[in-house]
Amino acid sequence: CKAMHVAQPAVVLASSRGIASFVCEYASPGKATEVRVTVLRQADSQVTEVCAATYMMGNELTFLDDSICTGTSSGNQVNLTIQGLRAMDTGLYICKVELMYPPPYYLGIGNGTQIYVIDPEPCPDSDF
C-alpha cells in the first residue's frame, strides 16, 4: 500500500435543505484507471462509513443503491454532495481515496471537512 495526498476544505455549511457539497482532490502518482472514494464521518471518536463510490477515469461515479451521496469527477477532483443532513449529522467528514486499478494500490485520507448542519426553523402558523 502506497500513500497519496488528499485535500479537502476545512469547513462547509450545509444548506437549509440539508445538502452539503465539497471537493475532494487527490494527487495521483500513477496512471489511475479506477478510483474508489469513500466518505467517512468522525464524531465522538467513532468513525462510520457514509457512502462509497467507484469510477473509471473520465466516467461518472457509481454509488451503491440507497446512497445519500452523489458526485461527479473531473481529473483528480471529485465533487461530492451529501443529502438529507440534519443538525445531529454535524461532524467531521473525511474523504478517503483509493487507486484501485491498475496496481500498485494507493491510499490517501484527507484531514476531513467539518460540516455544520442547522435544522431550519419551522414556519410559524399564520392567521388569514
Epitope: 474508489r36 473509471m56 496496481p103
Partner: antibody, heavy 118, light 107 residues
Framework: QVQLQQPGAELVRPGSSVKLSCKAS????????MHWVKQRPIQGLEWIGN????????HYNQNFKDKATLTVDKSSSTAYLQLSSLTSEDSAVYYC???????????WGQGTTLTVSS | DIQMTQTTSSLSASLGDRVTVSCRAS??????LNWYQQKPDGTVKLLIY???KLHSGVPSRFSGSGSGTDYFLAISNLEQEDIATYFC?????????FGGGTKLEIK
C-alpha cells in the same frame, strides 16, 4: 457496437506454443484494458492476466506467469495470448474480455477452444 | 487469493418464478462483485456490476444485492431465455476470481 472476435478453435501438439488472437472493434482499443480468462469444465473460470493496449503494461495471475504472455498490436486493434510448453492441462476455452468499471468485464469474445493433442 | 463460492451448482425453477443465486467471498470484497450469464453456446454477458448496477441492455428482471462477503443475484419472472449458467466474480483484489457457477434449468 463493441465486438471482440476470436477464432473458434485451435489444435496444437504437446510441447509446442500457440498464439491466440482477439480483434477488437467498435471502440477506442487503447482506452480499455484487455483481460484473458481460461475456462475448463471442472476448474471453471480462471483469470490469466491483463494488458493495457496503450503502453503494453501487463499483470499476470501467478499461476500463469510462466505459461502466458500477453501482447497487443495497436495498428490492428488486436490482443494476443501466447501459451508455451503446451500440455493437455492447457486444453480449454480461452476468452478475451474488455475491462469495465469495478473490474468487471463488459464485453467478451466468443472464446477460442484450444485442444492440445498428439 | 480470494475464494468465491457458489454453493448451489444447479437450480431448477418454473417459468415465471423468482430465483435467487448466491455467492460468498472468502473475505470482504467491498461490493466489487459482478455477475455474468453464460449461455450453452459459450456466449458470456455482463449482467450486474458493483453488486447492484444493471449493465446496459440487461432486462430489469435481473437485480443484485449484498455486502461484505455475501452477494445475491435475483431473477424475477423467469423466462426461457434465462436458461444459462450464472457466475459471480470479485474485482476487489488481483488475481480476480470467479465462482464455480450456478446452472439454471427449467422444471
Amino acid at each position: 457496437q463493441v465486438q471482440l472476435q476470436q477464432p473458434g478453435a485451435e489444435l496444437v501438439r504437446p510441447g509446442s506454443s500457440v498464439k491466440l488472437s482477439c480483434k477488437a472493434s467498435g471502440y477506442t482499443f487503447t482506452s480499455y484494458w484487455m483481460h484473458w480468462v481460461k475456462q475448463r469444465p471442472i476448474q471453471g473460470l480462471e483469470w490469466i492476466g491483463n494488458i493495457d493496449p496503450s503502453d503494453s503494461e501487463t499483470h499476470y495471475n501467478q499461476n500463469f506467469k510462466d505459461k502466458a504472455t500477453l501482447t497487443v498490436d495497436k495498428s490492428s486493434s488486436t490482443a494476443y495470448l501466447q501459451l508455451s510448453s503446451l500440455t493437455s492441462e492447457d486444453s480449454a476455452v480461452y476468452y478475451c474480455a474488455r475491462r469495465y468499471t469495478s473490474s468487471s468485464f463488459d464485453y467478451w469474445g466468443q472464446g477460442t477452444t484450444l485442444t492440445v493433442s498428439s | 487469493d480470494i475464494q468465491m463460492t457458489q454453493t448451489t451448482s444447479s437450480l431448477s425453477a418454473s417459468l415465471g418464478d423468482r430465483v435467487t443465486v448466491s455467492c460468498r467471498a472468502s473475505q470482504d470484497i467491498r461490493n466489487y462483485l459482478n455477475w455474468y450469464q453464460q449461455k450453452p453456446d459459450g456466449t458470456v454477458k455482463l449482467l450486474i456490476y458493483f453488486t447492484s448496477k444493471l449493465h446496459s441492455g440487461v432486462p430489469s428482471r435481473f437485480s443484485g444485492s449484498g455486502s461484505g462477503t455475501d452477494y445475491f443475484l435475483a431473477i424475477s419472472n423467469l423466462e426461457q431465455e434465462d436458461i444459462a449458467t450464472y457466475f459471480c466474480q470479485q474485482g476487489n483484489t488481483l488475481p480476480y476470481t470467479f465462482g464455480g457457477g450456478t446452472k439454471l434449468e427449467i422444471k
